[in-house]
């Protein structure tokens, strides 16, 4: 049994640096409690966005100082990143993991190739 | 960079009880989950058992469940394996391995001889 | 349990000759690793998700398959290349390996 995990392979972040997309994962089990990580991989190194744990039925709770929130809706997990400038540009990896009750599943998708771009700064108006 | 250390081995009894240790440096500790895998003298890898990221989920091989406890102290960046009614087919070399962002084994440490024998 | 058989047990090459081993598995897997450990040393990771090499492996290690098959490919031996070898799944409890295959100076 294998968990597979969807996304969408492109957005484009708002001007304000806000980028929103989908996680959806096929459940090979009934999982009372899911983690769901967003990883950036730029070359060939994979580091840790943002993570949530949560229990089905309930929020997700990133931590305080996260750049991520989000919402879950059964098997679906809608994630916004905020805060994003131009240098953010990659790809978003969506992990997500069966923590509970055994056995354990891992799920990976494709990534989403996030584009950003900054703002032109405004002109001064005489 | 990434570095983990295991101490705790040594020689014990069949039946008695031995605390591993694993103390990890170079990296965010608590946002990993943490493996003990092991092997015999001359044989293949065994998985042992792994703890996630706050230490609330814990799986065990069956060989082992019941008998070994894994545990973290994420203030310390360590992780433990407690083994008790330890038996001689529970020789061997034991190591702590990370789990990485994308799920294989990426860092393991040099590992700790546990030897049972009476 | 997902049980990951290795073939060959052992594989004699010389230097420079090309390398295939084997690893099948009971049922179908969804993430597969390849690691290489030499003598009086930890495992080292050279392949993940079936063909992704790991940060720092020469591209002369190279992973396929999918499923229940799977092969890893060393295109030249070269004499740091002379090792065990072990396949593991590590998409759903518990994490197993293969048994190994050992490859040895012919």
């Known amino acids: 049994k294998a968990m597979h995990v969807a996304q969408p392979a492109v957005v484009l972040a708002s001007s304000r640096g806000i980028a929103s997309f989908v996680c959806e994962y096929a459940s090979p089990g009934k999982a009372t409690e899911v983690r769901v990580t967003v990883l950036r991989q730029a070359d060939s190194q994979v580091t840790e966005v943002c993570a949530a744990t949560y229990m089905m039925g309930n929020e997700l709770t990133f931590l305080d100082d996260s750049i991520c929130t989000g919402t879950s809706s059964g098997n679906q997990v809608n994630l916004t990143i905020q805060g994003l400038r131009a240098m953010d540009t990659g790809l978003y990896i969506c992990k997500v993991e069966l923590m509970y009750p055994p056995p354990y599943y891992l799920g990976i998708g494709n990534g989403t190739q996030i584009y950003v771009i900054d703002p032109e700064p405004c002109p001064d108006s005489d | 960079q990434v570095q983990l250390v295991e101490s705790g081995g040594g020689v014990v009894q069949p039946g008695r009880s031995l605390r591993l240790s694993c103390a990890a440096s170079?990296?965010?500790?608590?946002?990993?989950?943490m493996h003990w895998v092991r092997q015999a003298p001359g044989k293949g890898l065994e998985w042992v058992a792994v703890?996630?990221?706050?230490?609330?989920?814990?799986y065990y091989a069956d060989s082992v469940k019941g008998r070994f406890t894994i545990s973290r102290d994420n203030s310390k960046n360590t992780l433990y394996l407690q083994m008790n009614s330890l038996r001689a087919e529970d020789t061997a070399l034991y190591s702590c391995?990370?789990?990485?962002?994308?799920?294989?084994?990426?860092?393991w440490g040099q590992g700790t001889l546990v030897t049972v024998s009476s | 349990e997902i049980v990951l058989t290795q073939s060959p047990g052992t594989l004699s090459l010389s230097p420079g000759e090309r390398a295939t081993l084997s690893c099948r598995a009971s049922?179908?897997?969804?993430?597969l690793a390849w690691y290489q450990q030499k003598p009086g040393q930890a495992p080292r990771l050279l392949i993940y998700?079936?063909?992704s090499r790991a940060t720092g492996i020469p591209d002369r290690f190279s992973g396929s398959g999918s499923g229940t098959d799977f092969t890893l490919t060393i295109s030249r031996l070269e004499p740091e290349d002379f090792a065990v070898y072990y396949c593991?799944?590590?998409?759903?409890?518990?994490?197993?390996f293969g048994q190994g295959t050992k490859v040895e100076i012919k």
């Open positions: 391995a990370r789990a990485g962002e994308l799920g294989p084994f990426d860092y």
């Open positions: 170079g990296f965010t500790f608590s946002r990993y989950g």
């Open positions: 703890i996630w990221y706050d230490g609330r989920n814990k």
């Open positions: 049922q179908s897997v969804s993430y």
């Open positions: 998700g079936a063909s």
């Open positions: 593991q799944q590590y998409g759903s409890s518990p994490w197993t």
